[in-house]
Interface confidence: medium
């Protein structure tokens, strides 16, 4: 999986993270997980293996299987949303995933607009993180 190493957005704003995956994983469950440790992070939202979007409170996820990209959006950002998150794909055996650091700039601070993934901030997952799914 490829995704941005970090994204930043202002408090009360929103951010979008795009995670790209290789051919063959189109119909697998995609998820967005919070926590520093890959093996104990908490899944906030996941697809059902289809392109149908899912929404859970302030977080939504949508999988574009043609482009092999799933998109996570977090809205109404709070300071305590700042953390390490993971884009992941559930499969038999260890899941695939890549880490994304979410930075929330306090309201009133000089903050940049929410960054979207570009080639310069893409982190390629090379298998160093393994997560056993439930």
């Amino acid at each position: 999986i490829q995704g941005p190493e970090s994204v930043r957005a202002p408090e009360q704003g929103s951010l979008t993270v795009q995670c790209h995956y290789k051919q063959g994983w189109e119909t697998y469950i995609k998820w967005w997980c919070r926590g520093v440790r890959w093996d104990t992070c908490k899944i906030l939202i996941e697809t059902r293996g289809s392109e149908q979007g899912e929404k859970s409170d302030r977080v939504s996820i949508k999988d574009n299987q043609k482009d092999r990209t799933f998109t996570v959006t977090m809205e109404g950002l709070r300071r305590d949303d700042a953390d390490v998150y993971w884009c992941g794909i559930e499969r038999r055996g260890p899941d695939l995933g890549t880490q994304v650091k979410v930075i929330v700039d306090p309201e009133g601070a000089a903050s940049t607009t929410a960054s979207s993934p570009t080639n310069s901030n893409m982190a390629v997952f090379i298998g160093s993180h393994k997560r056993n799914h439930y």
Epitope: K42, K55, S56, S60, Y134
Partner: antibody, heavy 114, light 107 residues
Framework: QIQLVQSGPELKKPGETVKISCKAS????????LHWVKQTPEKNLKWMAW????????TYADDFKGRFAFSLETSSNTAYLLINNLKNEDTATYFC???????WGQGTTLTVSS | DIVMTQSQKFMSTSVGDRVSVTCKAS??????VAWHQQKPGQSPKTLIY???YRYSGVPDRFTGSGSGTEFILTISNVQSEDLAEYFC?????????FGGGTKLEIK
């Protein structure tokens, strides 16, 4: 804001058919899945199905295969639950829900009695 | 099917108290558990998802914990408006299933 508004209460006889509607607003209808949940008079909740609002394809619980049909009218942002050949045990309140663990409709009470 | 068991059908508490509603899954469901609150004559309202995440607008006196097969909804500093029935629900595998509910009574 997001709202799911369901049709009003229904009183039917055994063997009849009922169609319950769930009209969504406040978001793009085809973006998120919709679910149907049955609540019995004893207050037990039973998940019936989820509907892919992009394709219209339902995923059913085994108990709700056969007499139950789930459909969409995307032009009006409305989901429908059709129950054929009604039985007394269909007496319940039926809820539509957005992506399951999220927003719920107000419920439609169905009474089946001869 | 995964059976979600809420062994206490009724719980009685007083305003200001702390109460814990328990739920046990017949199989490992990871953390894919939600808690719903249903007040008399109303539709359910989702309080907690992914075991411990509170929905926006849900008071922080509601907290969820657990993983695997054992889950707890804790209400600290119970208020009179918390009079309701509380349902756990797993969404780890089809069919999604609910607990039988725990009715909270305020003394």
């Amino acid at each position: 804001q997001i709202q799911l508004v369901q049709s009003g209460p229904e009183l039917k006889k055994p063997g009849e058919t009922v169609k319950i509607s769930c009209k969504a607003s406040g978001y793009t209808f085809t973006d998120y899945s919709l679910h149907w949940v049955k609540q019995t008079p004893e207050k037990n909740l039973k998940w019936m199905a989820w509907i892919n609002t992009e394709t219209g394809a339902p995923t059913y619980a085994d108990d709700f295969k056969g007499r139950f049909a789930f459909s969409l009218e995307t032009s009006s942002n409305t989901a429908y639950l059709l129950i054929n050949n009604l039985k007394n045990e269909d007496t319940a309140t039926y809820f539509c829900a957005l992506t399951m663990v999220n927003y719920w409709g107000q419920g439609t009470t169905l009474t089946v009695s001869s | 099917d995964i059976v979600m068991t809420q062994s206490q059908k009724f719980m009685s508490t007083s305003v200001g108290d702390r109460v814990s509603v328990t739920c046990k899954a017949s199989q490992n469901v990871g953390i894919r558990v939600a808690w719903h609150q249903q007040k008399p004559g109303q539709s359910p309202k989702t309080l907690i998802y992914s075991t411990s995440y509170r929905y926006s607008g849900v008071p922080d006196r509601f907290t969820g914990s657990g993983s695997g097969t054992e889950f707890i909804l804790t209400i600290s500093n119970v208020q009179s408006e918390d009079l309701a029935e509380y349902f756990c629900q797993q969404y780890n595998s089809y069919p999604y299933t609910f607990g039988g509910g725990t009715k909270l009574e305020i003394k």
